[in-house]
Interface confidence: low
């Protein structure tokens, strides 16, 4: 399910330039070894481990750069509004593409907390080179964060890092039809860590959704609901404090 | 500056129970699990569990499960460790350790606690 | 669980020496290895966090490499106030293991 991409390969300018075909706008290197640009701790937050995981626990306000922290990331209070009617996206003095979607944005939720769990509503549904971030952090002692990209009552992708099933830090990825679990694809690379800031980016692509944390690819997930269109919504639910979720168009 | 300091020793008679205290101070207590760490006379050391200070929940190893329990007094910054039906090979010192930044870590330790069981 | 196996089980050195101690892992713990220091009577202290990152106040004379299986610490230059028994421990998954001890001695 992971393959061994690094954003740092794609945009390093060695060899080739952008490896597996990534967009030139998926991410940013983060400041310093595992840092976040605008935090004071490059890469350790103090914390407390959920249990199984990542012993360490943040004290509130512990990622001093949130909301702006995170290129890329809509600056605080950045909300273009609300779509104006079926399927459009309008930009607030900016030029929109051909289709549903503008080439930029971001559009959703405003920066700042949010309310844990969060829909974000995805009107026109997903489409290809659709680029959804989500920012927030990490809970003192975090069990489970879960992001739903939902058709209906269908769950076309399940995105379910879990702190602690039978000792060990693990993602389950899945897909529900008709009340059905599938098959789960499970990735043991674990990028979160209890009381930590996170960026999570999910890449839609025409066959798969690509997710990235942190600025480095983590994953990918085949499409098994294939009307992308039908996708409207993205629940963001879990032991995290939200600090926004927007999409645009890359 | 961060301590952890634990109560006193203890000599107790098989059978009885021990309650061993950890007063934290010098951070935010809730921000960092407590681990308790066994080690007998001479032995290495042994991780019992930990304690989710935030919530409270206590997680054991399996050696440690069913005579031993956490606990929070969280208004006064300690953890506790409870052994109940002391048996001679409970003797050891037990230390508090907290959890630091990073994974599995533990950055501060108690001065540990003996705990003598003798008949 | 995972079985941590430090060698050599004791050590003699003499002093300005640089010497190393090995921790091998059952499985592969990525790099969440922490070393510590305990010193005859004394508490547990923590020398190095995530294979190779120091500790606060611990001296640059200490040193952790590895990830995977395989890790070691080395001190250079021993000092005297270095003689201590050295564990490690993994942070990977529960539950969290130490290895046997390494005791240090000086020649």
């Known amino acids: 399910m992971a393959d061994n991409f690094s954003l740092h390969d794609a945009l390093s300018g060695s060899g080739n330039p952008n490896p597996q075909g990534w967009p030139g706008a998926w991410g940013n290197q983060p400041a310093g070894a595992g840092g976040y640009p605008g935090a004071s701790y490059p890469g350790a937050y103090p914390g407390q481990a959920p249990p199984g995981a990542y012993p360490g626990q943040a004290p509130p306000g512990a990622y001093p750069g949130a909301p702006g922290a995170y290129p890329g990331a809509p600056a605080p209070g950045v909300y273009p509004g609300p779509p104006s009617g079926p399927g459009a996206y309008p930009s607030s003095g900016q030029p929109s593409a051909t289709g549903a979607y503008p080439a930029t944005g971001p559009y959703g939720a405003p920066a700042g907390p949010l309310i844990v769990p969060y829909n974000l509503p995805l009107p026109g549904g997903v489409v290809p080179r659709m680029l959804i971030t989500i920012l927030g952090t990490v809970k003192p002692n975090a069990n489970r964060i879960a992001l739903d990209f939902q058709r209906g009552n269908d769950v076309a992708f399940h995105f379910n890092p879990r702190f602690n099933e039978n000792n060990r830090r693990v993602i389950v990825c899945n897909t529900k039809l008709d009340n059905n679990w599938g098959r789960e694809e499970r990735q043991s690379v674990f990028p979160f860590e209890s009381g930590k800031p996170f960026k999570i980016q999910v890449l839609v692509e025409p066959d798969h959704f690509k997710v990235a944390v942190n600025d480095a690819h983590l994953l990918q997930y085949n499409h098994r609901v294939k009307k992308l269109n039908e996708i409207s919504k993205l629940g963001i639910s879990g032991d995290i404090d939200l600090t926004s979720a927007s999409y645009t168009m890359i | 500056q961060i301590q952890l300091v634990q109560s006193g020793p203890e000599v107790k008679k098989p059978g009885e129970t021990v309650k061993i205290s950890c007063k934290a101070s010098g951070y935010i207590f809730t921000n960092y699990g407590m681990n308790w760490v066994k080690q007998a006379p001479g032995k290495g050391l042994k991780w019992m569990g930990w304690i989710n200070t935030y919530t409270g929940e206590p997680t054991y190893t399996d050696d440690f499960k069913g005579r031993f329990a956490f606990s929070l007094e969280t208004s006064a910054s300690t953890a506790y460790l409870q052994i109940n039906n002391l048996k001679n090979e409970d003797t050891a010192t037990y230390f508090c350790?907290?959890?630091?930044?990073?994974?599995?870590?533990?950055?501060?330790w108690g001065q540990g606690t003996s705990v003598t069981v003798s008949s | 669980d995972i079985r941590m196996t430090q060698s050599p089980s004791s050590l003699s050195a003499s002093l300005g020496d640089t010497i190393t101690i090995t921790c091998h892992a059952s499985?592969?713990?990525?790099?969440?290895l922490s070393w510590y220091q305990q010193k005859p009577g004394n508490i547990p202290k923590l020398l190095i966090y995530?294979?190779?990152n120091l500790h606060t106040g611990v001296p640059s004379r200490f040193s952790g490499s590895g990830s995977g299986t395989g890790f070691t610490l080395t001190i250079s230059s021993l000092q005297p106030e270095d003689i201590a028994t050295y564990y490690c421990q993994q942070g990977q998954s529960y539950p969290y293991t130490f290895g046997g001890g390494t005791k240090l001695e000086l020649k």
């Open positions: 499985q592969n713990i990525n790099v969440w």
């Open positions: 995530k294979a190779s």
């Open positions: 350790a907290k959890f630091g930044n990073y994974v599995g870590a533990m950055d501060y």
